[in-house]
């Protein structure tokens, strides 16, 4: 016997109580694939979450975080407090990066400055709490009489100024 449910499109469910008629998903529910026997309840974005995309009969709602927070976890299942550039989030809140480390984002941890000498280069621009050091040519390249076919690359333009 053919399963009539396979004919039910996304946005509907196969209603066994009504002789396998395809019924539309009730309000606040969805089915993203055909042939479903139930519709899933839509996600609700409450508290620290805000709605990024409304639920439809064929797709779930998508959540984002309210201002001052950013998403963590699959499909934004958790929000984490933003910090300023030059800081990292600890158990006691936002703390400035220690000397020798930087963070150029509002999230994540402070990372150590690049050690230019490991690549045989010198420090062209000192690091800050918000920015990594910029490495320049090796000290040998800068010695008198040394010539270079190409000038040293300019210091990279910061993506955006620290807050």
């Amino acid at each position: 016997l053919q399963d009539l449910c396979s004919n039910c499109p996304a946005g509907t469910f196969c209603d066994n109580n009504r002789s396998q008629i395809c019924s539309p998903c009730p309000p606040n529910s969805f089915s993203s694939a055909g042939g479903q026997r139930t519709c899933d309840i839509c996600r609700q974005c409450k508290g620290v979450f805000k709605t990024r995309k409304e639920c439809s009969s064929t797709s779930n709602a998508e959540c984002d975080c309210i201002s001052g927070y950013h998403c963590l976890g699959a499909e934004c299942s958790m929000c984490e407090q933003d910090c300023k550039q030059g800081q990292e989030l600890t158990k006691k809140g936002c703390k400035d990066c220690c000397f020798g480390t930087f963070n150029d984002q509002k999230r994540g941890i402070c990372r150590p400055w690049t050690n230019c000498s490991l690549d045989g280069k010198s420090v062209l621009v000192n690091g800050t709490k918000e920015r990594d050091v910029v490495c320049g040519p090796s000290p040998a390249d800068l010695s008198p009489g040394a010539s270079s076919a190409t000038p040293p690359a300019p210091a990279r333009e910061p993506g955006h100024s620290p807050q």
Partner: antibody, heavy 118, light 107 residues
Framework: QVQLKQSGPGLVQPSQSLSITCTVS????????VHWVRQPPGKGLEWLGV???????DYNDAFISRLSITKDNSTSQVFFKMNGLQADDTAIYYC????????????WGQGTTLTVSS | DIVMTQSQKFMSTSVGDRVSVTCKAS??????VAWYQQRPGQSPKALIC???YRYSGVPDRFTGSGSGTDFTLTISNVQSEDLAEYFC?????????FGSGTKLEIK
């Protein structure tokens, strides 16, 4: 430190109402939401409703007709009222702070034990 | 409503062992799941949110995992103070719902 302290009656007659006050300290009700959850004797947890930092409320549909949650930010108090109590409303009632990271409960009150009996 | 099923009502373990408490959601809830510990006579205590993120102060012996419909709370190196009931909770949609609980007994 963060605390939620509950006060309310232990015994209520059938058809009467239950009022519980949850007084919070160590955080502001203008920043955090407060939920109410109950636990019948020897059973699991049941979510009743929440009042958010902006004063908006969400209720479990099963209780929406007889439940009211309000608050006073200035006194750091949340007020829970449930009408038309019956014997199966006998439970421990908890207030709990909403986590700042999700819709879960990161700190709980000590609980108010309610018995509904004549 | 989304039903959270904890099929094991009781689990028995010994100090130092590793134990896994499972929870199954009646539909896909992504990773919008939290876990709580309730010691006898006490209020519940938050352990995990977003399926795998430990709350501050929770020992790293407690680990959450899973997504979609199947979730697990693993306690490694079980201690006597872990004698408690453990509940899962979904926050995908209202009403927020809990599992019926799993009681951990220490031999």
């Amino acid at each position: 430190q963060v605390q939620l302290k509950q006060s309310g009656p232990g015994l209520v007659q059938p058809s009467q109402s239950l009022s519980i006050t949850c007084t919070v300290s160590g955080f502001s009700l203008t920043t955090y939401g407060v939920h109410w959850v109950r636990q019948p004797p020897g059973k699991g947890l049941e979510w009743l409703g929440v009042i958010w930092s902006d004063g908006n409320t969400d209720y479990n549909d099963a209780f929406i007709s007889r439940l009211s949650i309000t608050k006073d930010n200035s006194t750091s108090q949340v007020f829970f009222k449930m009408n038309g109590l019956q014997a199966d409303d006998t439970a421990i009632y908890y207030c709990a702070r909403n986590s700042i990271t999700s819709v879960s409960f990161d700190c709980w009150g000590q609980g108010t034990t309610l018995t509904v009996s004549s | 409503d989304i039903v959270m099923t904890q099929s094991q009502k009781f689990m028995s373990t010994s100090v130092g062992d590793r134990v896994s408490v499972t929870c199954k959601a009646s539909q896909n809830v992504g990773t919008t799941v939290a876990w709580y510990q309730q010691r006898p006579g006490q209020s519940p205590k938050a352990l995990i949110c977003s399926a795998s993120y430990r709350y501050s102060g929770v020992p790293d012996r407690f680990t959450g995992s899973g997504s979609g419909t199947d979730f697990t709370l693993t306690i490694s190196n079980v201690q006597s103070e872990d004698l408690a009931e453990y509940f899962c909770q979904q926050y995908n949609s209202y009403p927020l719902t809990f599992g019926s609980g799993t009681k951990l007994e220490i031999k």
